[in-house]
């Protein structure tokens, strides 16, 4: 397992929420991506391929998410100061074999301007 800081913009703020971008190598065909807050699993998404290359997407811990050919985005809404923490993208690679796990992350800073419902 390789741990490291994301070398890309992991957090994208909009409308009082945040999009957390978890990138994966484009050569990876089947995987599980988990979003961790500290050590806690917040969300996950698993992509597998069946016979005839049919793609299956499953989530055990469901969050609003978006899949592209090299990233999974997880969306958190109604931001408040309690969201400030270390977030990690925990990628488990099933294909290509052999099995690999890699962890990348960063700290989510919450500023007043990014909060959902500021008191006027």
């Amino acid at each position: 397992e390789i741990n490291g800081s994301a070398n890309y913009e992991m957090f994208i703020f909009h409308n009082g929420g945040v999009q957390i971008l978890c990138k994966y190598p484009d050569i990876v065909q089947q995987f599980k991506m988990q979003l961790l807050k500290g050590g806690q699993i917040l969300c996950d998404l698993t992509k597998t391929k069946g016979s005839g290359n049919t793609v299956s997407i499953k989530s055990l811990k469901f969050c609003h998410s978006q899949l592209s050919n090299n990233s999974v985005s997880f969306f958190l809404y109604n931001l408040d100061h309690s969201h400030a923490n270390y977030y990690f993208c925990n990628l488990s690679i099933f294909d290509p074999p052999p099995f690999k796990v890699t962890l990348t992350g960063g700290y989510l800073h919450i500023y007043e301007s990014q909060l959902c419902c500021q008191l006027k």
Partner: antibody, heavy 125, light 109 residues
Framework: EVQLVESGGGLVQPGGSLRLSCAAS????????MHWVRQATGKGLEWVAL???????YYSDSVKGRLTISRENAKKSLYLQMNSLRVGDTAVYYC???????????????????WGQGTTVTVSS | EIVLTQSPGTLSLSPGERATLSCRAS???????LVWYQQKPGQAPRLLIY???TRATGIPDRFSGSGSGTDFTLTISRLEPEDFAVYYC??????????FGQGTRLEIK
């Protein structure tokens, strides 16, 4: 010096069994995926089996259910248990190190960078 | 399953000449996963090129790799006597995890 040394080859009758071993030295064995690759006399290279750092195993269709790859990290050793051997399994068997790395959204393949000298398996009646 | 086809099967050249070896994949492969090896009689293969174009440690600069998609090439700019051997391309994939081409024999003319 980084080295892989195979042993255990020999002459065996069809249907028989053999266990190949590979002793690794000069590198952190448990950090690498390992393969067995074979080559029949005068023929090309044929991938046989793979074991990942997590112990997960993969096999070519031609050996599935008959050959078993395993590793003992404490002994820095790789094994190939060969059962129900066929004449078509006759070949030189190479123990091979796979150098690859995954870091975030990058996946690097550095090739099969270390090969043993090979051990000969002959299946004949 | 991706099939790698190497051509020519045998290449007859003289020392000092340029050698061009081809490896064609049955479907597109990532450049990062394409590798070349050299094998001399009675020896194990030796890693030459990885990532389609990066020379492995200790490989002379007369060896170069190129290509993308389905067509890859190994070029030896000026053949030395020790370069006459069998060359294999290989791809890291899914099922099987490793695929080899059938090899190109480079022989002295």
């Amino acid at each position: 010096e980084v080295q892989l040394v195979e042993s255990g080859g020999g002459l065996v009758q069809p249907g028989g069994s053999l266990r190949l071993s590979c002793a690794a030295s000069g590198f952190t064995f448990n950090g690498y995926d390992m393969h067995w690759v074979r080559q029949a006399t005068g023929k090309g290279l044929e991938w046989v089996a793979l074991i990942g750092t997590a112990g997960d195993t993969y096999y070519s269709d031609s050996v599935k259910g008959r050959l078993t790859i395993s590793r003992e990290n404490a002994k820095k050793s790789l094994y190939l248990q060969m059962n129900s051997l066929r004449v078509g399994d006759t070949a030189v068997y190479y123990c091979v190190r796979d150098r690859r790395a995954v870091a975030g959204h990058y996946y690097y393949f550095y090739g099969l960078d270390v090969w043993g000298q090979g051990t000969t398996v002959t299946v004949s009646s | 399953e991706i099939v790698l086809t190497q051509s020519p099967g045998t290449l007859s050249l003289s020392p000092g000449e340029r050698a061009t070896l081809s490896c064609r994949a049955s479907q597109s492969v990532s450049t990062s996963s394409l590798v070349w090896y050299q094998q001399k009689p009675g020896q194990a293969p030796r890693l030459l090129i990885y990532g389609a174009s990066t020379r492995a440690t200790g490989i002379p600069d007369r060896f170069s790799g190129s290509g993308s998609g389905t067509d890859f090439t190994l070029t030896i700019s000026r053949l030395e006597p020790e370069d006459f051997a069998v060359y294999y391309c290989q791809q890291f994939g899914s099922s099987p995890p490793i695929t080899f081409g059938q090899g190109t024999r480079l022989e002295i003319k």
